[in-house]
């Protein structure tokens, strides 16, 4: 099967909305970068549709995406990482829609990991630490992190703290005593590169101590 549409198919195709969005991930697999695109309308019939990127590439004109279920994906070392590329949705040789995109402005970092919370009894605080693979990267090294925490019973009442380091101190007196808390963290590029928030890290759950009646302080767990 050639993948070329019949004339009727092309006429139908032109009536559809082929708007799409993409994000890049740099050095996501060693020195390899990735680019992921998907249609904004989940109901688009993607059977004969392909994605192609041209321009701002190293020693090639264009690269074709691999189709992975509903998403289109490239993993390569061949991004120049400067200037705009032309990303097109194609049926055979015909481009249905194209976008000029600078891959350095659509960077989505990898999710932080190893989130943990340690209670310090003497200091009456909680030390939140997490890790990010970006500390070892050549390009997207500088990130802004968003730590979000909530009391488990408060469904949508998240408190957010932005920070550039991977360590945060939460004062015990700012938290409810004898309560279960959920905490998570995500990252966004913060220098030279621009883009989107990463996925959230897996949540970490911790309990605050009871209040010690004599001192008015919380009991450690």
């Amino acid at each position: 099967e050639s993948g070329y549409a019949q004339n009727g198919d092309l006429e139908d195709a032109e009536l559809d909305d082929y708007s799409f969005s993409c994000y890049s991930q740099l050095e996501v697999n060693g020195s390899q970068h990735s680019l992921t695109c998907a249609f904004e309308d989940p109901d688009v019939n993607i059977t004969n549709l392909e994605f192609e990127i041209c321009g701002a590439l190293v020693e090639v004109k264009c690269l074709n995406f691999r189709k992975l279920q509903e998403i289109y994906f490239i993993e390569t070392k061949k991004f120049l990482l400067i200037g705009k590329s032309n990303i097109c949705v194609k049926v055979g040789e015909k481009s249905l829609t194209c976008k000029k995109i600078d891959l350095t402005t659509i960077v989505k970092p990898e999710a932080p990991f190893d989130l943990s919370v340690v209670y310090r009894e003497g200091a009456n605080d909680f030390v939140v630490t997490f890790n990010t693979s970006h500390l070892q990267k050549k390009y997207v090294k500088v990130l802004m992190h968003d730590v979000a925490y909530r009391q488990e019973k408060d469904e949508n009442k998240w408190t957010h703290v932005n920070l550039s380091s991977t360590k945060l101190t939460l004062l015990q007196r700012k938290l409810q005593p004898a309560a279960m808390y959920e905490i998570k963290v995500r990252s966004i590029p913060d220098h030279y590169f621009k883009g989107f928030w990463s996925e959230w890290s897996p949540s970490y759950y911790f309990r605050t101590p009871e209040i010690n009646n004599s001192s008015g302080e919380m009991d450690p767990i």
Epitope: C54, G55, A56, L57, V58, E59, V60, K61, C62, L80, L81, I82, G83, K84, N86, E93, K100, D102, K138, Y139, Y192
Partner: antibody, heavy 119, light 105 residues
Framework: QVQLVQSGAEVKKPGASVKVSCKAS????????MNWVRQAPGQGLEWMGL????????SYNQKFKGRVTLTRDTSISTAYMELSRLRSDDTAVYYC????????????WGQGTTVTVSS | EIVLTQSPATLSLSPGERATLSCSAS?????MHWYQQKPGQAPRPLIY???KLASGIPARFSGSGSGTDFTLTISSLEPEDFAVYYC????????FGGGTKVEIK
Amino acid sequence: QVQLVQSGAEVKKPGASVKVSCKASGYTFTGYTMNWVRQAPGQGLEWMGLINPYNGVTSYNQKFKGRVTLTRDTSISTAYMELSRLRSDDTAVYYCARGDGEYWYFDVWGQGTTVTVSS
Amino acid sequence: EIVLTQSPATLSLSPGERATLSCSASSSVTYMHWYQQKPGQAPRPLIYEISKLASGIPARFSGSGSGTDFTLTISSLEPEDFAVYYCQEWNYPYTFGGGTKVEIK
């Protein structure tokens, strides 16, 4: 104003190497590719390669790969083109040219450096 | 690799006349650029992305075309327009055409 100033003319013997410099001013050096284009006497233009000054990533015309090396020094906003194993048919004017990152045309050019290869 | 063929190689015209320069690609090109070069000078951009005028270029210059056939038009030649004109493909390996020399008749 935006300007690219190249090093002076060179005369080299066959088999030698030449290194041409291109000093940029009036814009953010790391924000645009630097391209190298040559023109043999009475001939047309030939793209040799480019460098991304931000990260040093290069892209070469296959015709020159292995003989041309593009480098840059961001601290002095200068790009370099080194051509090795020179032959008489490398006699040409060598231009550096800034690459526009949106439309990929060469929007600012250096004045050119004449390289003469002669025994 | 795409080959860009410019025609004619030489165009002999008088000031005030209309000049039509062609650039034919061996396979389809998304965008084409045009440059002007005078003797002893570096090229300068005229038209980018088929039809957009580069900075400081007068409106008598225009570009058109798509696919494999592109045209640069100078509506009324001025004395300073007599020069060599090159088309160039927007993508790697940024190939140039062989040039068209516009000379005074």
